[in-house]
Amino acid sequence: IVKAGITIPRNPGCPNSEDKNFPRTVMVNLNIHNRNTNTNPKRSSDYYNRSTSPWNLHRNEDPERYPSVIWEAKCRHLGCINADGNVDYHMNSVPIQQEILVLRREPPHCPNSFRLEKILVSVGCTCVTPIVHHVA
């Protein structure tokens, strides 16, 4: 089902997908169809640099997972960028987190045996007012 440039080496303990007893409960086609057909280079993919709470992109890679690469946001500053381009610590940069579903190879190194897994990823950062605790 996963058509890719290289083949995941087969673990001898993998269930045999040709076996009549191989569970057929769920068949997942990993080719995602409703994607935009092209990408405009002028499209705003640079929010991570232009945001008032900019972030760096960390390449979260795991060969035992599909998708094997997930881009995660790491906020660059504790504060936010003000109109002068300086970091203002009266505001806070915080990550925006999203729970997503991924497929985890199980047993490990098996090319066509997966289990569904939920993971929490940071998809960007936003600027918030800090919570101020007043001490009596």
Epitope: A4, G5, I6, I32, T39, N40, L57, H58, P63, V69
Partner: antibody
Framework: EVQLLESGGGLVQPGGSLRLSCAAS????????MNWVRQAPGKGLEWVSG????????FYADSVKGRFTISRDNSKNTLYLQMNSLRAEDTAVYYC???????????WGQGTMVTVSS | QSELTQPPSASGTPGQRVTISCSGS????????VYWFQQLPGTAPKLLIY???QRPSGVPDRFSGSKSGTSASLAISGLRSEEEADYYC???????????FGGGTRLTVL
């Protein structure tokens, strides 16, 4: 069979422009990240640019930032590299690479030569 | 100058085990997976190792990769004359938001 075929290289004067293309076949193009890597004559490999998450993110080496633009057309299974304001130091073989099950650089094209000279 | 440091050359005799090192920093090797490539003379590079120690199908198990801290290494056991080539390491760099390659190691089979 998975294949990448680069084209568009050639001789160009300093300050000129070129557009490289990389035609892909044998796989679902839109699913995978693509990179351009170059190799100057007699030198090592240098990453140039990459496009990920169906174009959601594009990255560039500092040496080409502001001059080169990477893009892809999933309907044509083609990756592009628009190169402007070319310099002599951009002279190299440019390779198109595909990242799939292993994450990156699984498959390489044969390369296309770009020569920047007056 | 490359962000990842490799010895410019290495050598070994047929059947021998050779190791090629690759040194980086926390933002690249220390935080991300390492890739290794083989480039035979006059050909495009070929992926040898991905995700530190994983071999694509078709790559013999004589090739192995490992990583510790901010350094990585490629080991080739049972060296063959046809493995005389240039070997490169690479890793994503979080600080640069880009890939960094080593300068390459030319392996000579004596």
């Amino acid at each position: 069979e998975v294949q990448l075929l680069e084209s568009g290289g050639g001789l160009v004067q300093p300050g000129g422009s070129l557009r490289l293309s990389c035609a892909a076949s044998g796989f679902t193009f839109s699913e995978y990240e693509m990179n351009w890597v170059r190799q100057a004559p007699g030198k090592g490999l240098e990453w140039v640019s990459g496009i990920y998450s169906s174009g959601g993110y594009t990255f560039y080496a500092d040496s080409v930032k502001g001059r080169f633009t990477i893009s892809r057309d999933n309907s044509k299974n083609t990756l592009y590299l628009q190169m402007n304001s070319l310099r002599a130091e951009d002279t190299a073989v440019y390779y198109c690479t595909l990242g799939s099950a292993g994450g990156a650089f699984d498959i390489w094209g044969q390369g296309t030569m770009v020569t920047v000279s007056s | 100058q490359s962000e990842l440091t490799q010895p410019p050359s290495a050598s070994g005799t047929p059947g021998q085990r050779v190791t090629i090192s690759c040194s980086g920093s926390y933002s690249n090797i220390g935080s991300n997976y390492v890739y290794w490539f083989q480039q035979l003379p006059g050909t495009a590079p070929k992926l040898l190792i991905y995700s530190n120690n994983q071999r694509p199908s078709g790559v013999p198990d004589r090739f192995s990769g490992s990583k510790s801290g901010t350094s990585a290494s490629l080991a080739i056991s049972g060296l063959r004359s046809e493995e005389e080539a240039d070997y490169y390491c690479a890793a994503w760099d979080d600080s640069l938001s880009g890939w960094v390659f080593g300068g390459g190691t030319r392996l000579t089979v004596l």
